[in-house]
Every structure is written in structure tokens, then in C-alpha cells.
Interface confidence: medium
Amino acid sequence: EITRTTLQSDQEEIDYDDTISVEMKKEDFDIYDEDENQSPRSFQKKTRHYFIAAVERLWDYGMSSSPHVLRNRAQSGSVPQFKKVVFQEFTDGSFTQPLYRGELNEHLGLLGPYIRAEVEDNIMVTFRNQASRPYSFYSSLISYEEDQRQGAEPRKNFVKPNETKTYFWKVQHHMAPTKDEFDCKAWAYFSDVDLEKDVHSGLIGPLLVCHTNTLNPAHGRQVTVQEFALFFTIFDETKSWYFTENMERNCRAPCNIQMEDPTFKENYRFHAINGYIMDTLPGLVMAQDQRIRWYLLSMGSNENIHSIHFSGHVFTVRKKEEYKMALYNLYPGVFETVEMLPSKAGIWRVECLIGEHLHAGMSTLFLVYSNKCQTPLGMASGHIRDFQITASGQYGQWAPKLARLHYSGSINAWSTKEPFSWIKVDLLAPMIIHGIKTQGARQKFSSLYISQFIIMYSLDGKKWQTYRGNSTGTLMVFFGNVDSSGIKHNIFNPPIIARYIRLHPTHYSIRSTLRMELMGCDLNS
């Protein structure tokens, strides 16, 4: 319990002008009503339009965040970085605004975005090659007869750098799951200029075909199921288009490399899940007893036969009947859909049990959280101490340490007049944050409160992410308070896993003014 201290302040000017300050354009966000008109794609129509580009970027396979990685992979003594090319989704055909991934898609890693459609839908992919060499967009589902009508020769599927091509096809019944199978079925899309080189360079993504009326019109996905696509493969950087460039980057002169040296070859092979090795893939976070669907993919040569195991859990495969399994053998080019009802909260591992693959790092962790584990993290009780609460600035004596739910006194909240302000809480260790309770404050006859805000979070205090949650836009805007005393409880679904959490007011009355409590759970509990 916080002691109620009444802090004296100098005479402050009273601002009776009850204006609302707007600091961001409304169209930047999806305010979380289910208004499909705000979506970058309209899922109501039967044509589902995706804007996807091939984009080059540096990738380290998660080595910089893994405590296990042997630094001898890097000739230069630091974590090596490899140029890759990935499928990146954009908001529209101008290809200027990337659609950054939120918490629900973070697990895709190196993979391209989900392409989802139902039987009888049309899929339209506008593909732009922003890379430095020719690539293509290809799926075995694309009907090249239709493609030929647009004047393209079948299988001459190159798109030169800085060129754009539109692919259009109808989802046929044979591509969909049967009535006995799960609601959606996994396929893949990739580039097939040189299939092996293109995939080793990074171009692959999940394509989901679903039964009719499965996908929520507003969100473009099945909201009753949480989906995770996992691509198990051995990325061989010697087979990448960027091999020479990467070798020069990661091997400082004088660099004496014997191409046939087995150690050298092994240092350029990564036993990865979605492009991450050794338990570093982020985003595998799910609620206990929630229906989880895993799309398991493998590509490559025969060494890419994987034996997939989820520790502590069994999963279900559905063909004509439903089978409970603990292990799934995945073959290259075969994509499998399994479901799970995780009953045990905790941190678990998904791994390939083939000895060499497991030893080389083909595993990652998934977190199953309990929705029952939601308690106040200590803003009101005082468990969160003053030094843990900081802000971009403050108005007079309305300091960040006063931003505690139900705090009383004449000055009893954090307040600021600055535009683009923020308040930050350091929880000292990563926590699961399920929600936030907010409250405004009074000053004489004025009601001060934050009516809308966004949330940012971080594990290290350096790399920040904007919370997107279920929003189909680039971020989630939360509705806050409408008066000085009421409490608004906003839920984070999915929850946030972070050590630092930062609230950014976007709309407010008179001044951004806040008392709050964070609801959550110790990550270890």
C-alpha cells in the first residue's frame, strides 16, 4: 500500500481550456473496433490482395541473442551477419510502408508473411523485387494457365530488380483441407529462379488455405485458433546467392579459407527454425488450454528429414480420424498441420530430435502462460519503487513516481504538457503483462486524463517494439479515460513479455495525466 503523501506545489497556472490534443494521424492506427474498412486489405471481398516485396537484409540466425553460440563461427571474432533476401509485406502497391510484424506474427522470423485464403477465393499478390538480382514469386497452387492469359510464359517467372509483377489465381477445392481435416492447411510460396539457391537465400513463406467461412472478415485470420508456422531446414550459406559477399564480410583479411574444409562448411550451415538457431526464435507465446495450430514445413535435400517433438505436450493430427502423437516425422517438401491444447503452463521446447540437428541448434522455446496468473504488478502497492518509474518530462511537481493507481493528494499523478511524451516502468526483469489500468486526476476544477494511448515495450531498454496485438493496422491504439477518477482496464491480448513498458499518450484532456497499474505475472511463476 502506498502511503498517501500530500506533496505541496508552487502556485500552478490553471488551464480551463478542455481541448483535446491530437499528436498522431488517426489513419496511422487501427483503433480496436472491428472496422474492416481500416484494414490495409479488405477481407470482406473474395479477392485477397497482398503486397509483397523481396527485400535484402542482414541476418544473424539469432546468434547475437543466444548464450550458447560458439563465437568460432565467426572468423572476425564477432557474431557473423549474412545478407539474406526475405519476403516483406507492404501496406499497398506503392511499396513505401512495410507492414511491420506484431506479436502474433513475430514468430515467422525469416519467413514471409502469412497468405491466407478460403476455397473459391481469389488471391492476388503484387510482387515487387527490391533486391539486387532477379527473383520470383511462386507457389505450386498458382495456375499458370491463368498466368499465361496475362502474357507471361509459363515458368519464365523472373522479376528483375525494381520491377513489379502481379500474380492472380483462384483457390481450388483440391488445394483446401478435406472436411475431415483441420480448418486450414499449409502450403508454401517461394522464389523459383533457382529454387535451391533462392530458398537458401531466404525466400519462403507460409500460404494457408482454409474451409469457407473460417477467416474472420475484420482480421483476415481465424481468431478462435492461435497459429504458428515453423519452417525446419538447414540453411546452407554456401548455397546462397550472397555467399561470396557474406564470406568477405565475415572473414577479415588475411582470410585463408579452404572451401573443402569440413569445419568451414559446417560454420556456414545453420540448423534453424524460421531462420533462428539454439532457442532464439521469438514470439511462440500461447495461452494455456487455448487451441493452437502448428504448420510444420520442411524444404531441401534428404538431410532435411526432421523428427519434431514438443516437450511436455502431445499434439493431434487429423486425417480421416484424429490421432494423438508425441513425435512427427517431417519430410522435405511436405507441409503438415497439427493441433495442440497446451494444458501445462511453463516454458517448453520444440525441437528436432535427430541427434545432429538437435546438437546443431534446431530447437526453440515456447511459452504457455496461464490466464489466471494476473495480479497487480505493484504500482499501487508500492512493490514497484519510485526509481523504476521515469518519464520524458513532467509538469511542475506532477512527477512520474506519482503515476500510481488511486494515489491521493493535491498533486497525485504524473502529468506533462510536452507533446510526444511518454512514461516508462522498469519491471527489473521480464514479466508477462496482461493489461493496464489507467486513471486521470483533477486539478482544481479541471479533469486531466489521457483518452488514447499507444504502448511500447522492450526486453533490454534499447530495442523497442510498438504493441500491435489484434490490430490489422501497424499498431494498436488503446482508449483510455473519459474523466479524472474512473478506471479503464485495457487488456493486452496477446500479452506483452517485457522488462520495460512505455505508455505514449496520443490524445488527452488539457495535459497528459496518468495514474496506472500494470496487471501481469512473474515470468517464472
Epitope: I2, T5, L7, D386, F387, A399, K401, L428, A429, S525
Partner: antibody, heavy 126, light 108 residues
């Protein structure tokens, strides 16, 4: 060097209140929390609560809620612990401790009590 | 609240020997939030280890801490005569902060 000097031993009757002082020197008093911990004779340590000398904010263990008050006087760099409605079970040595938030030093670790007062024995007896 | 159980209650060893003290938590504790204290008769506790394994200022390197989750260990590699005292573990991650019951390290 950092020093925390506590008030002398005190004897109180059940139902009374006791106020223990803790005067800090050798550092900036308002920059560190003060925690209070007690220890009954021959027993282990029991955390009571914390107080921020800068803001006056405090947090308590549920057990002491309603009868524990933590205050401070920044002009004399002194923290106070007042415990009301004393019972014989409150007989103990009461310690104040400077709580160092290691996150200040960049290590990102939470506060631990790195400097302690010498302790004040409070005896509750009729 | 989190209950910390220390074992053994009493440990009898000779100077020069290695001491291993255990602290078990009733639920998982982040290693960032576990400390160890030493207390001699008539004295206030003294911080030895914070964050499960970081030595506090001025603490000799014969003291080391380890562990994670629910099991933590304080090790004194070579006992000196001044090391015989009572040792407490403390968790300071979940309110209320709690201490273990203590391990008395005595001369054999």
C-alpha cells in the same frame, strides 16, 4: 563511508507505539530507498517495508499494513519507522538498511540492502 | 508469498574446507532477484551476493553464488575462521521480500 545510525533500545507496553530513527551519513540520503527489517531473538530476518526519502512513497508487507508508518526528515537525513498497537510478538531488533538499486549502475539488477544500521532492540512487555 | 527454505539448518566444517549452502524457493524466482547475507552474533547482516551470482563490493572471491528457478547455492571455496556465521538467502522480486530461515555455519 556510508553509515546508518539507529536510535537506542526501547521498552514498550502492549498496545503502545514505538518510533525508531535511522540517521544516514556518507551518501545523498534522497538517492536511495530505506528498507526496514526486523529480527526476533534467535529467529530469522523479516522484511517490513521500504520508503523513498525523496518522495515519501512507501510500500509495506501485508502483515504490517495499517499499523506501520514510514516517514523521513530530509533536512536531517533521518528515516523513521513507527509501529503501532504493539504486541509481545513485536519484540525484536529492528534494522534500517540502505537499498541500492543496482540498475543505477547499469547492471540492471533490482535493489538489495547493501548497508545496514546497527539495529535497535524494541522490547514489548507488560 | 514466496517461502525460502535453507538447508542444512546447521553445517559443521573445519577451516580450509568447502561449504555448500542451499536455498530452495516455493516458486520460481528470477535469478536477478536472489541475494545472500552473512550475519555474525550481535551484528547486522552483511550483503555477500546479489543477482544470484554477483559479489557485492569488498566480498572475497572465495564466496560464489549460483542457481536459477527454485534452487540456489552459496559456495565458500575455502573456509576462513571469520566465515563462521549464519547465512540467509533473500528474494526481492515478488512482494513481500522474504528471507530464508538461515544456515548456521559452525566450526567442527
Amino acid at each position: 563511508q556510508v553509515q546508518l545510525l539507529q536510535s537506542a533500545a526501547d521498552v514498550k507496553k502492549p498496545g503502545a507505539s514505538v518510533k525508531v530513527s535511522c540517521t544516514a551519513s556518507g551518501y545523498i540520503f534522497t538517492s536511495y530507498d530505506i528498507d526496514w527489517v526486523r529480527q526476533a531473538t534467535g529467529q530469522g530476518l523479516e522484511w517490513m517495508g521500504w520508503m523513498n526519502p525523496n518522495s515519501g512513497n512507501a510500500g509495506f508487507a501485508q502483515k504490517f499494513k495499517g499499523r506501520l508508518t514510514l516517514t523521513r526528515d530530509t533536512s536531517t537525513s533521518t528515516a523513521y519507522m513507527e509501529l503501532r498497537r504493539l504486541e509481545s510478538e513485536d519484540t525484536a531488533v529492528y534494522y534500517c538498511a540502505r537499498s541500492t538499486p543496482h540498475s543505477y549502475s547499469g547492471s540492471g539488477l533490482p535493489p538489495t540492502s547493501d548497508s545496514w544500521g546497527q539495529g535497535t532492540l524494541v522490547t514489548v512487555s507488560s | 508469498e514466496i517461502v525460502l527454505t535453507q538447508s542444512p539448518g546447521t553445517l559443521s566444517l573445519s577451516p580450509g574446507e568447502r561449504a555448500t549452502l542451499s536455498c530452495r524457493a516455493s516458486q520460481s524466482v528470477s535469478s536477478s532477484f536472489l541475494g545472500w547475507y552473512q550475519q555474525k552474533p550481535g551484528q547486522a547482516p552483511r550483503l555477500l551476493i546479489y543477482g544470484a551470482s554477483s559479489r557485492a563490493t569488498g566480498i572475497p572471491d572465495r564466496f560464489s553464488g549460483s542457481g536459477s528457478g527454485t534452487d540456489f547455492t552459496l559456495t565458500i571455496s575455502r573456509l576462513e575462521p571469520e566465515d563462521f556465521a549464519v547465512y540467509y538467502c533473500q528474494q526481492y522480486g515478488i512482494s513481500p521480500l522474504t528471507f530464508g530461515g538461515g544456515t548456521k555455519l559452525e566450526i567442527k
